[in-house]
């Protein structure tokens, strides 16, 4: 089932609302304002910690700061997954975990963060300068990856602060398309507000020629941009940068399930809200995200994406249709 945001026909104002602004002028700014406020770039943070007790033991914690539904998390070392990195663990929010030596225990900490304990000796043992990367596949944002490693001078028992240094493996059609739409929406909102300041709102007359209500000239996604939201996307492979120490999180013991940013208004509603994504064998984790978007049309997650075009008066509604099962 293909789910696309529909632009509802706006009803004419009730006859009794003399002098009041038309629905178009009332509804549209709020809709666009909602878009602007909720529009935030997703972020992935990574925290790497060497355990004081065992020098070959590491704990990696990763979290996703975004409004979409996480469908898969891949943790790798030695660089980004699909760019020379080796998969350590794959975590699915409904179906469980697959992990590979030297991973000892991968687990979900919260709906948007995971932890992985690594233990090793000899060749499989992680060393202090190893880079660890976490990739979150989510709907509708696409795939976001960040990498981190211990600072060279860090003492055992200390951790690198969570580093939200995302590598842009952006869904070109999805993320850039949605961003463009939101930018356009925000500009249009400003334009509307300015126009509203300069002249009084005209009364909308019900259409005599058509029984339907007049459709406001609100932004509606073009067929091209609607299609773009469903296109399997190209992954930009970039080199993995070690974690930087500038971080949005406090240095002294960060809350690593992450204090949510204000833009993350729509959180996944629970485990059932997460979409299912095909998972290739460990050696071929090249573009998990393509599967995510290829399925997006047929198998929408229970919760709608963070992009709410027209708020339902009953609140954010789950998209219809159960999670697909093959």
């Amino acid at each position: 089932m293909r789910t696309e945001a529909q632009v509802p026909a706006l009803q004419p104002p009730e006859p009794g609302l003399e002098g009041a602004m038309g629905h178009r002028t009332l509804v549209l700014p709020w809709v666009l304002l909602t878009l602007c406020v909720t529009a935030g770039t997703p972020e992935v943070w990574v925290q790497v910690r060497m355990e004081a007790t065992e020098l070959s033991s590491f704990t990696i914690r990763c979290g996703f700061l975004g409004s979409g539904s996480i469908s898969l998390v891949t943790v790798s070392w030695g660089g980004p997954n699909g760019a020379g990195g080796t998969t350590l663990a794959v975590l699915h929010p409904e179906r469980g975990i697959r992990q590979w030596a030297p991973a000892r225990q991968a687990r979900w900490e919260t709906q948007s963060s995971i932890s992985l304990i690594l233990e090793g000796s000899g060749a499989s043992s992680p060393c202090a300068n190893t880079t660890f990367c976490c990739k979150f596949a989510s709907f509708p944002e696409g795939s976001w990856e960040a990498c981190g490693s211990l600072p060279p001078s860090s003492d055992p028992g200390l951790s690198a602060p969570p580093t939200p240094a995302p590598i842009l493996r952006a869904d070109l059609a999805g993320i850039l398309g949605v961003s463009g739409v939101l930018l356009f929406g925000c500009v249009y909102l400003l334009h509307l507000l300015r126009r509203h300041k300069h002249r009084p709102a005209p009364r909308l007359q019900p259409s005599r020629t058509s029984p339907q209500a007049p459709r406001a000239r609100a932004w509606a996604p073009s067929q091209a941009s609607q299609a773009a939201l469903h296109v399997p996307y190209a992954t930009i492979n970039t080199s993995c940068r070690p974690a930087t120490l500038d971080t949005a999180h406090p240095h002294g013991g960060p809350s690593w399930w992450a204090s949510l940013p204000t833009h993350a208004a729509h959180r996944p509603q629970g485990p059932a809200a997460w979409a299912s994504t095909p998972i290739p064998a460990r050696g071929s984790f090249v573009s998990v995200e393509n599967g995510l978007y290829a399925q997006a049309g047929e198998r929408p997650p229970h919760t709608g994406p963070g992009l709410t075009l027209f708020p339902d008066p009953r609140g954010p509604r789950a998209m219809e249709g159960p999670l697909g099962v093959r």
């Epitope: 975990i97 697959r98 290739p280 064998a281 071929s284």
Partner: antibody
Framework: EVQLQQSGPELVKPGSSVKISCEAS????????VDWVKQSHGKSLEWIGA????????SYNQKFEGKATLTVDKSSTTVYMELRSLTSEDSAVYYC????????????WGTGTTVTVSS | DIVMTQSQKFMSTSVGDRVSITCKAS??????VDWYQQKPGQSPKTLIH???SRHTGVPDRFTGSGSGTDFTLTISNIQSEDLADYFC?????????FGGGTKLEVK
């Protein structure tokens, strides 16, 4: 037809080692992980570990670390499990099973190999 | 480790009946539970994966349900060939663990 053909029964002495095999056919070998499961006589099943045929990456149940070693030979599309320092507790039927990465489950099971440890 | 408890070790039923085999996880395992059937002297066969998805070729008499900690395999219109052991498996966390099994006896 997808098949996992396991090697025949083994009768071994305590303290020795045994290497059993699981030959895959009917599918692209590298696309699926292979897991191993132990079934002691009259008992339930125990997950031993998994191997990824692509790179030989392994994952073990801690209980079987040091007991079982998983290896792969891509040229013969065969996965091996070596069991060492055998005791009577290791007498069991051992199964290999194909793990579906897309759907997260075992869809095909091997024929099973009976290992008997006896002096 | 997560413990998967199949409280009924044996269940007796008649042809045409309906039976529900239960499996309880010691902690929340979402829908990461599969059901396997093992007939005497044979390898296990896959029935249900992801708690409720029927494996290819499995008759629709077999139905899986549940999520979190409580899972059920329901067999309706039981046939004599359903005489077997039934195991649940969780793969939510490592190590993966199986239930103790339920032996279905058909009168």
């Amino acid at each position: 037809e997808v098949q996992l053909q396991q090697s025949g029964p083994e009768l071994v002495k305590p303290g020795s080692s045994v290497k059993i095999s699981c030959e895959a056919s009917g599918y692209t070998f590298a696309d699926y992980n292979v897991d191993w499961v132990k079934q002691s006589h009259g008992k339930s099943l125990e997950w031993i570990g998994a191997i990824n045929p692509n790179d030989g990456g392994t994952s073990y149940n801690q209980k079987f670390e040091g007991k079982a070693t998983l290896t792969v030979d891509k040229s013969s599309t065969t996965v091996y499990m070596e069991l060492r320092s055998l005791t009577s507790e290791d007498s069991a039927v051992y199964y290999c099973a194909r793990w579906v990465n897309n759907d997260w489950y075992f869809d095909v099971w091997g024929t099973g190999t009976t290992v008997t440890v006896s002096s | 480790d997560i413990v998967m408890t199949q409280s009924q070790k044996f269940m007796s039923t008649s042809v045409g009946d309906r039976v529900s085999i239960t499996c309880k996880a010691s902690q929340n395992v979402r829908s990461a539970v599969d059901w396997y059937q093992q007939k005497p002297g044979q390898s296990p066969k896959t029935l249900i994966h992801s708690a409720s998805s029927r494996h290819t070729g499995v008759p629709d008499r077999f139905t899986g349900s549940g999520s979190g900690t409580d899972f059920t395999l329901t067999i309706s219109n039981i046939q004599s060939e359903d005489l077997a052991d039934y195991f649940c498996l969780q793969h939510w966390n490592y190590p993966y663990t199986f239930g103790g099994g339920t032996k279905l006896e058909v009168k």
